[in-house]
């Protein structure tokens, strides 16, 4: 088999026939050095998954439940291409499973026990697996058989396809539980009708069901969605209030050596030639000898799944939780109203050691999880491997785009009411050596630059955003002669000045000596022409305040700030000479952990915060000898956000817009992945 062949897995005679037709038609339109198709027939989707894992086949299209199976060890497959529905301009690759209720009914998600429920059908995704999976640990024990537990949880249900003899309560609202449209309450529209008719109190359907059944907005306004955080939202706010976001139909491949680029090349060319309304001879999204063969008949095309996206991220935390609960049937011992330990995400060894010290001192309230980069940490929080971390504003933006929420803000100024008063922010500045007297904001081209890290506020987003507005391109590595911007591509000139050894060179963590505020300033001291840092960095590392050999003899007077008007000012005049105001660093978490992270961190800062006077004899949460480990070292307290509890509100319109403008220059693979899930 030539190297450019994609072996497609078919699960029936009809699929195999369509696959052969696909193969032959692709041969006729693609040059001989292009991708080609070979067909492999297996008895089931699970057999296809195993065949791909064993390198006997390369690709198959699966629905969400099977994507989960494909991801599990030992299969370890990943999503590579998604089918989309709707239009090319507004492609839909996901649907949302929602819980719909009548507006005046007054109960929340955590009050569903004893209510009457309407389901699309037993074992179906939006109508059963997702809601029951998410409610699983609230079901009365024993939870097996599942149908009995569900029947005892709700006061009555319509769950088409259930066994009405063994579980009559599941058929109470639709006598007979018929498994077809003969049952008026079957399927999406049926489950909604069950709610509309007043038979049930809640319907588990997908987001489009309400719009398909109620064309009139005034009618839709009689209904609301139940959100997982025990609030309600209007039915058109399903993106912010759903049980799970579910991919419709996805091509999977091996995680390693999976030919994902080749599969995309093949499918992209296939949709060009044989997609919707392209060819009479062969149609990719049509199944004359059956239904949904190889691909869904309703699909309009394909989109490449970003490479950073693994199956867990693609399926989303809620969906994975629901399916795992159903499959594994395990629930925590602890009562659900008690907070479990918060799993803090620590970057590299230095942070992990401090985190472990915190964990020991916290007496079981804090646990630690390690990752190599901030983006890896954010991904771990998204999928539940970790719960929280404190982030620079640039990463609060990425975390927010990935569905995380800010929960507390670092405050840097001493005040009587620190915890109740989140600050306006700190200043992003450009520092130069006083001796380089000809250097100004207007002649930085060709100079050597020092950055905290790519994607961070003071070190990257603000200065590079301003620079982008001037030069109108993203080739910052050509603008500066060389520099250190940890997180840049290793062969970039913006890694040339970095000091990390071996694989640690230019890594965006403390293994790179020029990482972070202190690192960027050190880079200026030792090699660079300009450092992009925060206004406190110079005073914190001069006048003997940093005992490290490189810093101990430094004098603040030897450094100056570059102002945007082309002038320079002394370091202490940052208020009149800065690049922009930056939002303070903030702790982020998943929505479901928000309350517990808030509660535990407030307890922890009362024990180990700034009120601890002797850090040599006690653990201090906000100290790490100028290394900013876990939190910035100048943190005075973690402050409540009040109503600034989304990333947009926290960061502010101006900063969100600035980072949005820089998006075209973004190298963040995580941001790309998250905007795929939520454009």
């Amino acid at each position: 088999v030539p190297d450019k062949t994609v072996r497609w897995c078919a699960v029936s005679e009809h699929e195999a026939t369509k696959c052969q037709s696909f193969r032959d038609h692709m041969k006729s339109v693609i040059p001989s050095d292009g991708p080609s198709v070979a067909c492999v027939k297996k008895a089931s989707y699970l057999d296809c998954i195993r065949a791909i894992a064993a390198n006997e086949a390369d690709a198959v299209t699966l629905d969400a439940g099977l994507v989960y199976d494909a991801y599990l060890a030992p299969n370890n497959l990943k999503p590579v291409v998604a089918e989309f529905y709707g239009s090319k301009e507004d492609p839909q690759t996901f649907y949302y499973a929602v819980a719909v209720v009548k507006k005046d009914s007054g109960f929340q998600m955590n009050q569903l026990r004893g209510k009457k429920s309407c389901h699309t059908g037993l074992g179906r995704s939006a109508g059963w697996n997702i809601p029951i999976g998410l409610l699983y640990c609230d079901l009365p024990e024993p939870r097996k058989p599942l149908e009995k537990a569900v029947a005892n949880f709700f006061s009555g249900s319509c769950a088409p396809c259930a066994d009405g003899t063994d579980f009559p309560q599941l058929c109470q609202l639709c006598p007979g539980c018929g498994c077809s449209t003969l049952n008026q309450y079957f399927g999406y529209s049926g489950a909604f009708k069950c709610l509309k008719d007043g038979a049930g109190d809640v319907a588990f359907v997908k987001h489009s069901t309400i719009f398909e059944n109620l064309a009139n907005k005034a009618d839709r306004d009689q209904y609301e969605l139940l959100c997982l955080d025990n609030t309600r939202k209007p039915v058109d706010e399903y993106k912010d209030c759903h049980l799970a976001q579910v991919p419709s139909h996805t091509v999977v491949a091996r995680s390693m050596g999976g030919k994902e680029d080749l599969i995309w090349e093949l499918l992209n060319q296939a949709q060009e030639h044989f997609g919707k309304d392209k060819s009479k001879e062969f149609q990719l999204f049509s199944s004359p000898h059956g239904k949904d063969l190889l691909f869904k008949d309703s699909a309009h095309g394909f989109l490449k799944v970003p490479p950073r996206m693994d199956a867990k991220m693609y399926l989303g935390y809620e969906y994975v939780t629901a399916i795992r609960n159903l499959r594994e049937g395990t629930c925590p011992e602890a009562p659900t109203d008690e907070c479990k330990p918060v799993k803090w995400c620590a970057l590299s060894h230095h942070e992990r050691l401090k985190c472990d010290e915190w964990s020991v001192n916290s007496v079981g309230k804090i646990e630690c999880v390690s990752a190599e980069t901030t983006e890896d940490c954010i991904a771990k929080i998204m999928n539940g491997e970790a719960d929280a971390m404190s982030l620079d504003g640039g990463f609060v933006y990425i975390a927010g785009k990935c569905g995380l929420v800010p929960v507390l803000a670092e405050n840097y100024n001493k005040s009587d009411n620190c915890e109740d008063t989140p600050e306006a922010g700190y200043f992003a500045i450009a520092v130069v050596k006083k001796s380089a007297s000809d250097l100004t904001w207007d002649n930085l081209k060709g100079k050597k630059s020092c950055h905290t890290a790519v994607g961070r506020t003071a070190g990257w987003n603000i200065p590079m955003g301003l620079l982008y507005n001037k030069i109108n391109h993203c080739r910052f590595d050509e603008f500066f002669s060389e520099g250190c911007a940890p997180g840049s591509k290793k062969d970039s000139s913006l890694c040339k000045l970095c000091m990390g050894s071996g694989l640690n060179l230019c890594e965006p963590n403390n293994k790179e000596g020029y990482y972070g505020y202190t690192g960027a300033f050190r880079c200026l001291v030792e090699k660079g022409d300009v450092a992009f840092v925060k206004h406190q960095t110079v005073p914190q590392n001069t006048g003997g305040k940093n005992p490290d050999p490189w810093a101990k003899n430094l004098n603040e007077k030897d450094y100056e700030l570059l102002c945007l008007d082309g002038t320079r000012k002394p370091v202490e005049e940052y208020a009149n000479c800065h690049l922009a105001r930056a939002p303070n660093h903030a702790v982020v978490t998943r929505k479901d952990k928000e309350a517990c992270v808030h509660k535990i961190l407030r307890q922890q800062q009362h024990l180990f915060g700034s009120n601890v006077t002797d850090c040599s004899g006690n653990f201090c949460l906000f100290r790490s000898e100028t290394k900013d480990l876990l939190f910035r070292d100048d943190t005075v307290c973690l402050a409540k956000l009040h109503d600034r509890n989304t990333y947009e509100k926290y960061l502010g319109e101006e900063y969100v817009k600035a980072v949005g403008n820089l998006r075209k220059c973004s190298t963040s693979s995580l941001l790309e992945a998250c905007t795929f899930r939520r454009p």
Epitope: D356, S359, V360, N361, S362, V363
Partner: nanobody
Framework: QVKLEESGGGLVQAGGSLRLSCVAS????????VIWYRQAPGKQRELVAL???????NYRESVKGRFTISRDDAKNTVWLQMNALEPEDTGVYYC??????FGQGTPVTVSS
């Protein structure tokens, strides 16, 4: 009230070994983990190694591969085995567990 007592320190040549022990009087010792710190003359106290109740261990970068922390709950003791000692390891070594004040420490001097 739990009290901690460190012992095992002394004068040793570079490359040599020492085994420090931390013994607790009283019950509930180390339920949440035990940390060894050290303080060199004129320097801040720094974490050397820690061991949690589940046996998880971690070390500061400069001692990794040379020092080993271990525990024996039956004996209410935590040890720090120090091999390939370097002059930079000189200092007073303390063990600590949450809620219990620092003990006297045990001095370690590594001569070159």
């Amino acid at each position: 009230q739990v009290k901690l007592e460190e012992s095992g320190g002394g004068l040793v040549q570079a490359g040599g070994s020492l085994r420090l022990s931390c013994v607790a009087s009283g019950s509930g010792f180390g339920i949440n983990g035990v940390i060894w710190y050290r303080q060199a003359p004129g320097k801040q106290r720094e974490l050397v190694a820690l061991i949690k109740s589940d046996g998880y261990t971690n070390y500061r970068e400069s001692v990794k591969g040379r020092f080993t922390i271990s525990r024996d709950d039956a004996k209410n003791t935590v040890w720090l085995q120090m091999n390939a000692l370097e002059p930079e390891d000189t200092g007073v070594y303390y063990c600590k567990t949450p809620g219990v004040p620092f003990g006297q420490g045990t001095p370690v001097t590594v001569s070159s």
